[in-house]
């Protein structure tokens, strides 16, 4: 079954409404905001999660603090348009008819325009670099232990196939996790690296998307790995198209 049967909840997505109205009285869960049915045995797409987050009552939503390190996803939260599979639509527009093109992780990759703006295809983000700084510890983590634990984390918690974790680099206190997934590599049923990175980002921020009030418990040989800052860089299969005006502003 696709959800925790006993109390009909979605283990992998707390931003859902679940009820035993599936086939044969099975537990079925729908994402808040979009009402789309979700598969609770795997991650929910980032697009549906953002939509659910924006639909939550304002007083229930955590305020997003603009970070001095927000180098890439500068636009922050928005209420996205998702396709029937839950992926981002290539063109996103706000209520004032300002439109822009996004990549597969929903990050803007063009200048903003009007309703005449065309986004011919959803460009895939095929390489994600997660740059972390951990809090001071008694000594450095053993690199091979750290590598193994982070790979296990992405495999077990985020259901990401190990072949998509390209590398784990470590120079105390900086950890870099490289995720790579070309269109040709991603098979049906594979978790998308963008979704895995988003779940990880929310876990690191203490805003876990998994069921319950608890958070991430990440340890390397028993020593807690606590992150004090995160930067995520996205590389697309086709380079973004920003005007020179934006680059010199």
């Amino acid at each position: 079954h696709t959800a925790a049967q006993d109390n009909c909840t979605c283990p992998t997505n707390k931003m859902t409404v679940c009820s035993p109205d599936g086939p044969g009285g099975r537990c079925q869960c729908r994402a808040l905001g979009s009402g789309m049915a979700v598969d609770c045995s795997t991650l929910t797409s980032k697009c549906l999660l953002l939509k659910a987050r924006m639909s939550a009552p304002k007083n229930a939503r955590t305020l997003v603090r603009p970070s001095e390190h927000a180098l890439v996803d500068n636009d922050g939260l928005y209420d996205p348009d998702c396709d029937p599979e839950g992926r981002f639509k290539a063109r996103q527009c706000n209520q004032t008819s300002v439109c822009w093109c996004v990549n597969s992780v929903g990050v803007r990759r063009t200048d903003k325009g009007d309703l005449s703006l065309r986004c011919d295809e959803l460009v895939r983000t095929h390489h994600i670099l997660i740059d972390l700084r951990h809090r001071p510890t008694a000594g450095a983590f053993n690199h091979s232990d750290l590598d193994a634990e982070l790979r296990r984390l992405f495999r077990e918690r985020y259901r990401l196939h190990p072949k998509f974790v390209a590398a784990v680099h470590y120079e105390q206190p900086t950890i870099q996790i490289e995720l790579r997934q070309n269109t040709s590599q991603k098979a049906a049923g594979d978790v998308d690296i963008g979704d895995a990175a988003y779940y990880f980002e929310r876990d690191i921020k203490g805003e876990s998307l998994f069921q319950g009030r608890g958070g991430l418990d990440l340890r390397v040989r028993g020593e807690p790995l606590q992150v004090e800052r995160t930067l995520i860089y996205y590389l697309d299969e086709i380079p973004p198209k920003f005007s020179m005006k934006r680059l010199t502003a």
Epitope: T9, P11, L153, R157, F210, R213, G214, L216, D217, R219
Partner: nanobody, 123 residues
Amino acid sequence: QVQLLESGGGLVQPGGSLRLSCLASGRTVGRTAMGWFRQPPGKEREFVATISWAGGTTYYADFVKGRFTISRDNSKNTLYLQMNSLRAEDTAVYYCAASEPYSDYDPSGMVYWGKGTLVTVSS
């Protein structure tokens, strides 16, 4: 997906002891927080105790503190509940539960459940 199978329940006299076991199977059990819950006859299911995946942190309901001990053996994929000084009000079906991998020991994060084992405390 995690599968859980409880054992060790039975009839015991007041003041007696019992040890429950829960065998976990599935690809992720080594990194799941786990816990025990119980459902007394005619009542709601209630939290008993939880333990972190590394085993270093435990959390108990007030009514079992000092009497029950939760522990785990990750090499055997097994969770235990040692129950001492049992009382009639401890009579219940005891359920083993597990979290998603790498979740902490918060009881609200338990999403996978066993079928339960009945503990009856009676003279």
